[in-house]
Amino acid sequence: ISYDSPDYTDESCTFKISLRNFRSILSWELKNHSIVPTHYTLLYTIMSKPEDLKVVKNCANTTRSFCDLTDEWRSTHEAYVTVLEGFSGNTTLFSCSHNFWLAIDMSFEPPEFEIVGFTNHINVMVKFPSIVEEELQFDLSLVIEEQSEGIVKKHKPEIKGNMSGNFTYIIDKLIPNTNYCVSVYLEHSDEQAVIKSPLKCTLLPPGQESESAESAK
């Protein structure tokens, strides 16, 4: 295979490589395919040491349109020469290729999180996997955004060590009986477009004074 030749290239596939729950997930979408494939096979090799294309075991004859490559793509420095083959039964419909360099191509999906509202603070529980590969840390920082009445405040908690295990952050000095919304995301060291989580909102319970004022009425 000549990796500089566009023989394999097919503009009818759109690829996306994402860090989802600290796992490298390659997903794809097809454009202008009259026949929808019944299954796919993903193959790759490393650009710096081109060998025969290797089939990704858990993505051979898969019906899914994504592939977990965490255990295959271990380096953020290598370029991975990737070929996606689409089949209908035994017939090969197409093959698309693309080279991926994780250090620059990766997008970062927000972690899962829960919020619990108290009178004047919110506990934000961010869920990280228990173990995260060192290569997949990516100089990321966690950002928690607090929104209320059109005002957005950014919190950048300092996480000791790497992002693994569950992490709790307290947004304090809040106003009772007020609606607050929270979003979390992972920010890269550069201006890469961030993917913010959907907002989770909570109406804080009223404080003591307003309760006593209510009962005095």
């Epitope: 290239t9 710096s48 380096s75 420095h77 290598e78 370029a79 080279n99 620059i104 191509d105 997008s107």
Partner: antibody, heavy 117, light 112 residues
Framework: QVQLQQSGPELVRPGVSVKISCKGS????????MHWVKQSHAKSLEWIGV????????RYNQKFKGKATMTVDKSSSTAYMELARLTSEDSAIYYC??????????WGQGTSVTVSS | DIQMTQTPLTLSVTIGQPASISCKSS???????????LNWLLQRPGQSPKRLIY???KLDSGVPDRFTGSGSGTDFTLKISRVEAEDLGVYYC?????????FGGGTKLEIK
């Protein structure tokens, strides 16, 4: 064969901006990232940053943040770098360089930028 | 940022004689993936730089085997077994292990 064709020399006044281009040919443009490197007498070679030609993600050398802006036009297989608020310190030759992973392999012929009043 | 220090600044060599250039980094260039992203470039007079060696010792296609790269961690060497006239120019080492990528100051090889 792989070629990176850069735009011609620029003679510009201090304080203005300049946008230089780099057209890739002989390979699949979106399969390789594009870097920009500055070469000046004072500082030899300096890495400015890199852009993903497929996703347009960028990574800048902190020193050039606010000075350089990298963009890409996939349809014409062209990478661009704009340099803002030019001073005499920005007078240099600027190269675009292709890379697959952490290996810059092919270099453009360079674009000379001279800042002079 | 990682500092890359090259020595000597200038190297004056007779054709047919060996040459050696040293490159030292301020931090180890060994990555967690087990590879070392140390590379060498040659810039001939009036030309753009051209990649010679990548990953410490791998020769780019078309580079004669009189060039060898070696080293590990923070200390690296480029050797030319027998210098030829076409080898003159400025040699640069650069590292791609840590962002921002950084270059050595260059070593000018001139023919005696």
């Amino acid at each position: 064969q792989v070629q990176l064709q850069q735009s011609g020399p620029e003679l510009v006044r201090p304080g203005v901006s300049v946008k230089i281009s780099c057209k890739g040919s002989g390979y699949t443009f979106t399969d390789y990232a594009m870097h920009w490197v500055k070469q000046s007498h004072a500082k030899s070679l300096e890495w400015i940053g890199v852009i993903s030609t497929y996703y347009s993600n960028t990574r800048y050398n902190q020193k050039f943040k606010g000075k350089a802006t990298m963009t890409v036009d996939k349809s014409s297989s062209t990478a661009y770098m704009e340099l803002a608020r030019l001073t005499s310190e920005d007078s240099a030759i600027y190269y675009c360089v292709r890379s697959g992973g952490s290996n810059m392999d092919y270099w453009g012929q360079g674009t000379s930028v001279t800042v002079s009043s | 940022d990682i500092q890359m220090t090259q020595t000597p600044l200038t190297l004056s060599v007779t054709i047919g004689q060996p040459a050696s250039i040293s490159c030292k980094s301020s931090q180890s260039l060994l990555d967690s993936d087990g590879k070392t992203y140390l590379n060498w470039l040659l810039q001939r007079p009036g030309q753009s730089p051209k990649r010679l060696i990548y990953l410490v010792s791998k020769l780019d296609s078309g580079v004669p085997d009189r060039f060898t790269g070696s080293g590990s961690g923070t200390d690296f060497t480029l050797k030319i077994s027998r210098v030829e006239a076409e080898d003159l120019g400025v040699y640069y080492c650069w590292q791609g292990t840590h962002f921002p990528w950084t270059f050595g100051g260059g070593t000018k090889l001139e023919i005696k």
